[in-house]
Amino acid sequence: FERTRSLQDPCSNCPAGTFCDNNRNQICSPCPPNSFSSAGGQRTCDICRQCKGVFRTRKECSSTSNAECDCTPGFHCLGAGCSMCEQDCKQGQELTKKGCKDCCFGTFNDQKRGICRPWTNCSLDGKSVLVNGTKERDVVCGPSPADLSPGASSVTPPAPAREPGHSPQ
């Protein structure tokens, strides 16, 4: 089948990094500067992504692969292929419509992105607070008095964090 296809379509022989040039009798021509083709048999090359403004070049464009971008310091990537950059906040803050704001009492954020999450409620598990929470750190739950027997585990790790999103304004 491959041999039949290539007899019918000379373009199928053009490798990645080239395009099938209709203006030159369908011969394989190299992709022009600032363009690429990542698969064989293409009739055009795609324009390379330009990482400018808040975007930085993480990987240069080549004749066979597109450029890859990340974000300038103080920002982080969002979306498929880093299609957007969102500003970082400090630990203990979350990004709102009014910019970076401190976590309210009883909530924390230990990252530079995402939302402030409520401290773990130790009493729900029958535990006591071993280490108080802060804006940057969750509480650490310790044993309840009944657990203080030899061989009992002394510290329970906090509950896993919820998926980041944005709390209502």
Epitope: G53, M84, C85, E86, H166
Partner: nanobody, 123 residues
Amino acid sequence: EVQLVESGGGLVQPGGSLRLSCAASGFTFSSYWMTWFRQAPGKGLEWVAHIKEDGSEKYYVDSVEGRFTISRDNANNSLYLQMNSLRAEDTAVYYCARGGDGYSDSHYGVDVWGQGTTVTVSS
């Protein structure tokens, strides 16, 4: 080509005023939140203000609230930043940026950025 071009920067004395403009082209301007950022010499980028697609919501960083006003003219694909009572600490390169899809609903990511215009506040 999607493009943002800022203008209006310059040298101004403390207490003075400037109006920055941002001309947008290559996309449907009225469909996007728009944002101003700034970068002071030797410092990181700082968010200044942003404005909803129809201009009905505007938000400012605390340090410029009451002194700066963000506005837009969707008919002319233009974004503005009116800066009054300027201070030395407002000295920076000012950039306009386009909010990405879903801006303010699920994130505050930007995807298109201008080249910047320089504001210097000095006596």
